[in-house]
């Protein structure tokens, strides 16, 4: 059998096979050693017994999407049945005091590979034996501690495969310079050691994407905005836009990145090299935000211009390959190509509470003695829309330990002036956070207040 017979049906075109050679990967036309690495179809009854105590699940993730030319990293994590884990020696052991369907196990090991390899290795002096090889016959690399690596991972994409010896978690990075744009499929088959052979334990596949567009995401933040994820913001307060470029392999680290903004409110184009920008909308309504990101990234060199046509025919100087103009196309050329990313969002701008201030605090004199508590009135003004809710959070003087939170609907007059009355149990210094909210906004003000003993002579004061 060949690798492509074993590893999946998604066979790319001959064009891909010829042109998309991945560095360090091999063609899936190579032969697969079925004696050492048996192949089981989906639904084969043998899968049931491929692992002691249940099924192993392989989880394949990637940091896709990848900008063409950058590296994409795939990670495979094995999830063992309940109560099982890999120990420092690479053996699979039962977790202490963990009870599964079979109860507590007397044998600490699920798989004691250390013992197996000591018993069965029959190696020559080099530490190499006929069974310490990958499915294509290549010997295992002898990294320090390689004997503790008991899983064989075979990655397969674009008609090529990559073999890796590992523990319960492995990572593989692939350069995408030669990968066709668009969605691609990565398949991984995982084997475990089994005496002098290997047993399949899991198969997993995942789609990854290679793109020529810079993957761009914009976060938006605005003070007093109640919900930053609904793309509804407040008039007359700056919104901070922060551009996040998905570049996990740092491909664009040395690129100059330009950001071109159109906020959709007839304020024109704004060009910057900074990934953050502030913008204030001064009208209510719906606006179309557009961002174009431009970066000069390493990329393929353009083909050389054709040689100038001589006016008179001249004898050929030799084969076309000797043309001196072609000598500039050496493999190590460092050409740049402009890559672009786009982000578009529809932003709704509404009225909101812009500001809240405590302008006065008064100790409410009670008609009867009540030594345990004080009633304090906070006279509050606000700017912007009509608040519907007031919350007070009363905490210790450091404003860290909350003692009491009270929220209630509030009725506000046309001037946005209201009085909030709160009870303070006992004298002392308190931190008061007061927020006014409506459907879209939440405005906060804070003050330190010193509540005196219930002696009429002691005045209420704002603490500094």
């Amino acid at each position: 059998k060949r690798f492509h017979d074993v590893l999946g049906n998604e066979r790319p075109s001959a064009y891909m096979r010829e042109h998309n050679q991945l560095n360090g990967w091999s063609s899936d036309e190579n032969d697969w050693n079925e004696k050492l690495y048996p192949v089981w179809k989906r639904g084969d009854m043998r899968w049931k017994n491929s692992w002691k105590g249940g099924r192993v699940q392989a989880v394949l993730t990637s940091d896709s999407p990848a900008l063409v030319g950058s590296n994409i990293t795939f990670a495979v994590n094995l999830i063992f049945p309940r109560c099982q884990k890999e120990d420092a020696n690479g053996n699979i052991v039962y977790e202490k005091n963990c009870r599964n369907e079979a109860g507590l196990s007397a044998d600490p090991y699920v798989y004691n590979w250390t013992a197996w390899s000591e018993d069965s290795d029959g190696e020559n002096g080099t530490g190499q034996s006929h069974h310490n090889v990958f499915p294509d016959g290549k010997p295992f690399p002898h990294h320090p501690g390689w004997r503790r690596w008991n899983f064989i991972y075979v990655f397969h994409t674009l008609g090529q495969y990559f073999q890796k010896l590992g523990r319960c978690s492995v990572r593989v990075s692939v350069n995408t310079a030669n990968v066709t744009l668009g969605p691609q499929l990565m398949e991984v088959t995982v084997y475990r050691r089994h005496g002098r052979a290997y047993v399949p334990i899991a198969q997993v596949k995942d789609v990854y994407v290679v793109t020529d567009q810079i993957p761009v995401f914009v976060t938006m933040f605005q003070k007093n905005d109640r919900n930053s994820s609904d793309e509804t913001f407040l008039k007359d307060l700056p919104i901070m836009f922060d551009v996040l470029i998905h570049d996990p392999s740092h491909f664009l680290n040395y690129s100059t990145i330009n950001y071109k903004w159109s906020f959709g409110d007839n304020t024109g184009l704004f060009v910057s090299t900074n990934h953050t920008v502030n913008h204030t909308y001064v009208l209510n309504g719906t606006f179309s935000l557009n961002l174009t990101v431009k970066a000069a990234a390493p990329g393929p060199c353009p083909p050389p211009p054709p040689p100038p046509r001589p006016s008179k025919p001249t004898p050929s100087l030799g084969p076309a390959g000797d043309n001196p103009l072609e000598l500039s196309r050496i493999p190590d050329e460092n050409c740049q190509i402009n890559r672009y990313g786009h982000f578009q969002a529809t932003i709704t701008i509404v009225e909101g509470i812009l500001e809240v201030n405590i302008i006065q605090m008064t100790d409410v004199l009670m008609p009867v003695p009540w030594p345990e508590s004080s009633l304090i009135d906070f006279v509050v003004t606000c700017q912007g829309s009509i608040p519907t809710e007031v919350c007070t959070i009363i905490s210790d003087p450091t404003c860290e330990i909350t003692q009491n939170t009270v929220c209630s609907p509030v009725d506000v007059d046309e001037m946005c002036l209201l009085t909030v009355r709160r009870t303070f149990n006992g004298s002392g210094t308190y931190c008061v956070n007061l927020t006014l909210g409506d459907d879209t906004s939440l405005a906060l003000t804070s003050t330190l207040i010193s509540v005196p003993d219930r002696d009429p002579a002691s005045p209420l004061r704002m603490a500094n």
């Epitope: 009509i386 519907t388 007070t392 209630s408 609907p409 009725d411 009355r421 009870t423 409506d438």
Partner: antibody
Framework: EVQLLESGGGLVQPGGSLRLSCAAS????????MSWVRQAPGKGLEWVSS????????YYADSVKGRFTISRDNSKNTLYLQMNSLRAEDTAVYYC?????????WGQGTLVTVSS | QSVLTQPPSASGTPGQRVTISCSGS????????VSWYQQLPGTAPKLLIY???QRPSGVPDRFSGSKSGTSASLAISGLRSEDEADYYC???????????FGGGTKLTVLG
Amino acid sequence: EVQLLESGGGLVQPGGSLRLSCAASGFTFIRRPMSWVRQAPGKGLEWVSSISHSGGSKYYADSVKGRFTISRDNSKNTLYLQMNSLRAEDTAVYYCARKWSTFDYWGQGTLVTVSS
Amino acid sequence: QSVLTQPPSASGTPGQRVTISCSGSSSNIGNNYVSWYQQLPGTAPKLLIYADSQRPSGVPDRFSGSKSGTSASLAISGLRSEDEADYYCGAWDSSLNAYVFGGGTKLTVLG
């Protein structure tokens, strides 16, 4: 002069639905929260629901949560209460009231009777 | 059973001073404004006191409200026969996220 006029009450069978309306005049409706309060025959007042000036914030009594829906049409200066899955214990005079931290103006009420 | 507790009835003779109490907790009366409502027989309720002790315009100064900790009270001085009505206290409850009323007090003017 502030005026609140309820309508839509009547006799309905258990499990049935009814929609109450409250027409407001004499004040800037769009700037005020509004509420519904009910009073069962011979019993005390029970708050039912409140809605903010824009309609974005709504509060309900536990006894009606999931069955009643408060809404408003600011262009028509009208408050609504959609009542579904009505029960015998919802029988009451339903009052429309202005504001929600205190009820400073009340309508005359509309009687809802839930009976088979 | 109401969240706010009022005496079911109170009485007094004309000219007398009568006080109606309303007891709650820190989540309602203790940290939110108390209102008082008057309901004359066969009519809709009417706001009598708001913000613990404020009178809306048109309400005689014979009616006064006060609050102490988690209790509030309504005082009516110079009692008149037209004051015979049901009186309800009310406040927002921040724990229940609901407006709560007392069970009501039936005031009878004797004589």
